[in-house]
């Protein structure tokens, strides 16, 4: 598994470096998770041909994965720091059930899948400290999540491979959009 942010050799070699700001820590954390997703996607793409699937095939999948929209305030048109931050946190909380689903989906990258899941939990904590309007953040219902997880795990092999691919791709895109917006804040 990769070394968590703040513990790589470069940091050890530079003891007099200024401590990271909250924004820098969040930035580094997201890039760390993106690295993890890259490694997981590599295994997925090597194992199946899902990565070459057409967008039509992906669109047919009825997963309700979080996605950025104009109304969320994270794009330049209609950019709104607080609305956007709420969307990012809410989206990450919604992704957690899908990251749990990924836990048994990898052979050689099992630790990496766990690292992505745990790092996302840490990222949520960082972002919650940054948010002023925590009341606006809706936490997913555990019962609904549990039944969704059961449903996903009951799919046939092809659908499970497709689901894994879709989750990784969507999570990557969500994090990229989130980080781009966070870099404006």
């Amino acid at each position: 598994a990769p070394v968590p942010p703040g513990e790589d050799s470069k940091d050890v070699a530079a003891p007099h470096r200024q401590p990271l700001t909250s924004s820098e820590r969040i930035d580094k954390q997201i890039r760390y998770i993106l690295d993890g997703i890259s490694a997981l996607r590599k295994e997925t793409c090597n194992k199946s041909n899902m990565c070459e699937s057409s967008k039509e095939a992906l669109a047919e999948n009825n997963l309700n994965l979080p996605k950025m929209a104009e109304k969320d305030g994270c794009f330049q048109s209609g950019f709104n720091e607080e609305t956007c931050l709420v969307k990012i946190i809410t989206g990450l909380l919604e992704f957690e059930v899908y990251l749990e689903y990924l836990q048994n989906r990898f052979e050689s990258s099992e630790e990496q899948a766990r690292a992505v899941q745990m790092s996302t939990k840490v990222l949520i904590q960082f972002l919650q400290k940054k948010a002023k309007n925590l009341d606006a953040i809706t936490t997913p219902d555990p019962t609904t999540n549990a039944s969704l997880l059961t449903k996903l795990q009951a799919q046939n092999q092809w659908l499970q491979d497709m689901t894994t691919h879709l989750i990784l791709r969507s999570f990557k895109e969500f994090l990229q959009s989130s980080l781009r917006a966070l870099r404006q804040m």
């Epitope: 330049q76 990557k172 990229q176 959009s177 980080l179 781009r180």
Partner: nanobody, 124 residues
Framework: QVQLQESGGGLVQAGGSLRLSCTVS????????MGWFRQAPGKEREFVAD????????WYADSVKGRFTISRDNAKNTMYLQMNSLKPEDTAVYYC?????????????????WGQGTQVTVSS
């Protein structure tokens, strides 16, 4: 290491247009976020615009909004900057850059590879 090559710069009168291109070598072009920056003599390099991998997240500096348009063609490994209603203050060397994380942003440190730059001069 990714290679970037800008082209399309030149001398143009105020009010005129130019279209800059940035061609990238490397098969993972379509996963990169890309940005345009510019640097006038004696000034710091400043953000102009950036674009994500599938062109659905574009950002512009306030100074160019409504006049410049960033776009990309993943099949051609090329990014563009259409510059209209040019002003003398747009005079600078224009650089393209890539962010391999696919994020982009308004600071040079967010990007890991840069082109050599192309000169744009707007005369009054």
């Amino acid at each position: 290491q990714v290679q970037l090559q800008e082209s399309g710069g030149g001398l143009v009168q105020a009010g005129g247009s130019l279209r800059l291109s940035c061609t990238v070598s490397g098969r993972t072009f379509s996963t990169y976020a890309m940005g345009w920056f510019r640097q006038a003599p004696g000034k710091e390099r400043e953000f102009v615009a950036d674009i994500n991998w599938n062109s659905d997240n574009l950002w512009y500096a306030d100074s160019v909004k409504g006049r410049f348009t960033i776009s990309r063609d993943n099949a051609k490994n090329t990014m563009y900057l259409q510059m209209n209603s040019l002003k003398p203050e747009d005079t600078a060397v224009y650089y393209c850059a890539v962010d391999s994380y696919g994020v982009g942003g308004g600071k040079p440190e967010y990007y890991d590879s840069w082109g050599q730059g192309t000169q744009v001069t707007v005369s009054s």
